[in-house]
């Protein structure tokens, strides 16, 4: 396993609809054709997998149908979107990138993006 640099923003604020987007960029050390991207959430020293996708260079990023993540790839950067977020989902979201093929295998883990989610206030009842 060889190490690889990964960069991502330090902080992102989710929209009022519970959607957060951020870029994950990696320093590809060679001609990788198969890349796996995983989003991990760290909160209270617990790390859980949020979503993962494997893609071939030049093709779209495909997450499972029931995934809360969507994304697009362009060169050695991935634009990730996580939806359905609630205030309780606030935490550090870490981008993990693996160059699966061809060998050698490379692994890179970003420092994480702190995503803040604020639940919207319910609208007050209107007299109209």
């Amino acid at each position: 396993c060889k190490a690889m640099h990964v960069a991502q923003p330090a902080v992102v604020l989710a929209s009022s609809r519970g959607i957060a987007s951020f870029v994950c960029e990696y320093a590809s050390p060679g001609k990788a054709t198969e890349v796996r991207v995983t989003v991990l959430r760290q909160a209270d020293s617990q790390v859980t997998e949020v979503c993962a996708a494997t893609y071939m260079m030049g093709n779209e990023l495909t997450f499972l149908d029931d995934s809360i993540c969507t994304g697009t790839s362009s060169g050695n950067q991935v634009n990730l979107t996580i939806q359905g977020l609630r205030a309780m989902d606030t935490g550090l979201y870490i981008c993990k990138v693996e160059l699966m093929y061809p060998p050698p295998y490379y692994l890179g883990i970003g420092n994480g993006t702190q995503i803040y989610v604020i639940d919207p206030e319910p609208c007050p009842d209107s007299d109209f």
């Epitope: 640099h5 990964v6 960069a7 991502q8 870029v23 960029e25 990696y26 320093a27 590809s28 050390p29 060679g30 001609k31 990788a32 054709t33 260079m57 030049g58 060169g75 050695n76 950067q77």
Partner: nanobody
Framework: EVQLVESGGGLVQPGGSLRLSCAAS????????VGWFRQAPGKEREELSC????????DYPGSVKGRFTISRDNAKNTVYLQMNSLRAEDTAVYYC???????????????????WGQGTQVTVSS
């Protein structure tokens, strides 16, 4: 859209040095990571080095580490490749390529670059 033009190639004796330049027009190069590649006749394109947008991150494959140095001057919209201790096997057409990125990293994979220069010929011979 950014356009790239390489210069600085030519004929050099073994053991000599050259500095290649990659000048950009049409856009500011500071928004782009830049890589240098070369292709010798009948061979695949080979990665040589890359540099991130700010210049703080660079990368080299083992084959040229210690002999080649990449740098950039964003004020001049130019990236440079300093090549020392040149050998006959360094003879090739040298290309620079650019990729618009958000952060400071760069890639050594030719697959990641979407804008390429026309190349400059480097010949190492006595």
């Amino acid at each position: 859209e950014v356009q790239l033009v390489e210069s600085g190639g030519g004929l050099v004796q073994p053991g000599g040095s050259l500095r290649l330049s990659c000048a950009a027009s049409g856009d500011t190069l500071e928004s782009f990571a830049v890589g240098w590649f070369r292709q010798a006749p009948g061979k695949e394109r080979e990665e040589l080095s890359c540099i991130g947008r700010t210049g703080e991150f660079t990368d080299y494959p083992g084959s040229v580490k210690g002999r080649f140095t990449i740098s950039r001057d964003n004020a001049k919209n130019t990236v440079y490749l300093q090549m020392n201790s040149l050998r006959a096997e360094d003879t090739a057409v040298y290309y620079c390529a650019a990729e618009r990125l958000v952060f400071h990293l760069c890639s050594l994979s030719e697959y990641d670059y979407d804008t390429w220069g026309q190349g400059t010929q480097v010949t190492v011979s006595s």
